[in-house]
């Protein structure tokens, strides 16, 4: 993984044992018409490849041009390849669309490593396995890029689902989801179920597999077990949340909770790893090493660089601890925790050893821009981005990878005081530089 860039992300699909279906809690809030229930046409509409992103099929222009688009909750531009590129099988051809409108404005997006640039316009957009609507949306037509598109990833663009504040070139460029909600009756909410396979997949397996679901405008009960627990969206830019406590195998890291959110904590489907601020990462790795001390691994493994292999089917999951993040709850002084397994934070890697081995990379890494709850976290859970009520919900995913001894969990409530103090207030002057860094 190139930790300097948020992309590529990892998926991994299908084949995961289903989580045990737990009885529904009785204190769940009442059904809201159009927001909950069954969204059969949208279930299983995501595909992807380990480390390279979950994508949805979209159509752009008239007549419609079909493209696979990476689902990214960590950015806010809808941007698609619009010129030939060695890694693209197809691209958006504006000249073939009768509904394309040029905004006569350029856009440039640098990452820590890599960049893309393009020309802004609008066109008609729809999601075949989504709501039955067509919207006119802003599109960045990518004409030049460096280390952005990924060879073999099978996606040709990116759908930034975060808020206008972080859109490029500025917050006046309305993001796709805002346009969708404004122009249709689709409720202001979407939910994601990212399904990690627990084992690497080759290209043909990816194309034939299900990678998860993006439910636009609602919540599908079949995609999760137990209850949904909600944490407030602290500020509408990234999907920013507040972590109030971290435990490794039930042992509190005992850090000032501000450290967990320094300089922010976000939920980001466009990042592979669980990324932690330097101090938190060091404490977490120390604790994970101690918990798994019956076996030792090289430093390069803990840095996410080297991969470790075991005989197929003998990965010692039991020696690796569970990791719990406590998130601020909706009620004063109340929190809940989400718990992931090593099956989430050890990422299967393909094509390196022999077929007789299962090989993994450590998918927790260091960050200089705060905590990023990437695929490592999201693959354990069904995540509801309830923009209308400014909150994010977590429930145990029906497709998460686990074993017979442990399962991912979402549990609460817990009493936690002074949670507001856990948030870090970014000095106003720093923001512009922080947003271009994306480290």
């Amino acid at each position: 993984t190139q930790h300097g860039i948020r992309l590529p992300l990892r998926s991994g699909l299908g084949g995961a044992p289903l989580g045990l279906r737990l009885p529904r809690e009785t204190d769940e809030e009442p059904e809201e018409p159009g927001r909950r229930g069954s969204f059969v046409e949208m279930v299983d509409n995501l595909r992807g490849k380990s480390g390279q992103g979950y994508y949805v099929e979209m159509t752009v222009g008239s007549p419609p041009q079909t493209l696979n688009i990476l689902v990214d909750t960590g950015s806010s531009n809808f941007a698609v390849g619009a010129a030939p590129h060695p890694f693209l099988h197809r691209y958006y051809q504006r000249q073939l669309s009768s509904t394309y409108r040029d905004l006569r404005k350029g856009v440039y997006v640098p990452y820590t490593q890599g960049k893309w640039e393009g020309e802004l316009g609008t066109d008609l957009v729809s999601i075949p396995h989504g709501p039955n609507v067509t919207v006119r949306a802003n599109i960045a037509a990518i004409t030049e890029s460096d280390k952005f598109f990924i060879n073999g990833s099978n996606w040709e663009g990116i759908l930034g689902l975060a808020y206008a504040e972080i859109a490029r070139p500025d917050d006046s460029l309305e993001p796709f989801f805002d346009s969708l909600v404004k122009q249709t009756h689709v409720p202001n909410l979407f939910s994601l179920q990212l399904c990690g396979a627990g084992f690497p997949l080759n290209q043909s397996e990816v194309l034939a597999s299900v990678g998860g679901s993006m439910i636009i405008g609602g919540i599908d009960h079949s995609l999760y077990t137990g209850s949904l627990w909600y944490t407030p969206i602290r500020r509408e830019w990234y999907y920013e949340v507040i972590i109030v406590r971290v435990e490794i195998n039930g042992q509190d890291l005992k850090m000032d909770c501000k450290e967990y959110n320094y300089d922010k904590s976000i939920v980001d489907s466009g990042t592979t790893n669980l990324r932690l601020p330097k101090k938190v990462f060091e404490a977490a790795v120390k604790s994970i090493k101690a918990a798994s001390s019956t076996e030792k691994f090289p430093d390069g493994f803990w840095l996410g660089e080297q991969l470790v292999c075991w005989q197929a089917g003998t990965t010692p999951w039991n020696i690796f601890p569970v990791i719990s993040l406590y998130l601020m709850g909706e009620v004063t002084n109340q929190s809940f925790r989400i718990t992931i397994l090593p099956q989430q934070y050890l990422r299967p890697v393909e094509d390196v050893a022999t077929s007789q081995d299962d090989c993994y990379k450590f998918a927790i890494s260091q960050s200089s821009t705060g905590t990023v709850m990437g695929a490592v976290i999201m693959e354990g859970f069904y995540v509801v981005f309830d923009r209308a009520r400014k909150r994010i919900g977590f429930a145990v995913s029906a497709c998460h990878v686990h074993d017979e001894f442990r399962t991912a969990a979402v549990e609460g409530p817990f009493v936690t005081l002074d949670m507001e103090d856990c948030g870090y207030n970014i000095p106003q002057t720093d923001e512009s530089t922080l947003m271009t860094g994306r480290a």
Partner: antibody, heavy 120, light 108 residues
């Protein structure tokens, strides 16, 4: 300073089990800083990794030999062991024991090696 | 499986000359590569680790470079005791398992 010394029979009959001992002197096999390993080299050929062991007993084996190999450790005697079953002439080689240091990555200290011939 | 290919198989040089040995990996191994020297009847000796770091006691005339898939061991000026077989090994995939086929440096 730390030294490693292989010992065991120099001749093993086909289909039998090859057994070797590596004795660590001048340091403790129970150091948390090292794995211990076996590597072999058929006459006139290259090096082949056999497997590693940590003092806790945790083992890793070469997939191509896995079905026939057992590596074990006796911390009280400061020794680790290699057993290779159902040997054939293709297992004739110089067998080396070595220390996996530099953060468990590199074989930084080797025994002199012992030639084991498989022949009836 | 990652395959390491060493070239040339044999390098014929005179003392004082510069030796350049190559090791190519079938896929990226980052900088997780070592070089070993083996003299006849002796065990291998670690020369270079992490692609470019000299092991303890190794003379400065030995240097390693490269990352990803292409690596080089350079002996700046061959001494009589440097004529031996040299092996590379990758440890990107752990535990370390793959050695190259070796390059023999012989006296011309």
């Amino acid at each position: 300073q730390l030294q490693l010394q292989e010992s065991g029979p120099g001749l093993v009959k086909p289909s039998e089990t090859l057994s070797l001992t590596c004795t660590v002197s001048g340091g403790s096999i129970s150091s948390s800083s090292y794995y211990w390993g076996w590597i072999r080299q058929p006459p006139g050929k290259g090096l082949e990794w056999i497997g590693n062991i940590y003092y806790s007993g945790s083992t890793y084996y070469n997939p191509s030999l896995r079905s026939r190999v057992t590596i074990s450790v006796d911390t009280s005697k400061n020794q680790f062991f290699l057993k290779l079953s159902s040997v054939t002439a293709a297992d004739t080689a110089v067998y080396y024991c070595a220390r996996l240091g530099h953060g468990y990555n590199y074989f930084d200290l080797w025994g002199r090696g012992t030639l084991v011939t498989v022949s009836s | 499986e990652i395959v390491l290919t060493q070239s040339p198989a044999t390098l014929s040089l005179s003392p004082g000359e510069r030796a350049t040995l190559s090791c190519r990996a079938s896929q990226s191994v980052s900088s997780y590569l070592a070089w070993f020297q083996q003299k006849p009847g002796q065990a291998p000796r670690l020369l270079i680790y992490d692609a470019s770091n000299r092991a303890t006691g190794i003379p400065a005339r030995f240097s390693g470079s490269g990352s990803g898939t292409d690596f080089t061991l350079t002996i700046s000026s061959l001494e009589p005791e440097d004529f031996a077989v040299y092996y590379c090994q990758q440890v990107y995939v752990w535990p370390p398992r793959t050695f190259g086929g070796g390059t023999k440096v012989e006296i011309k």
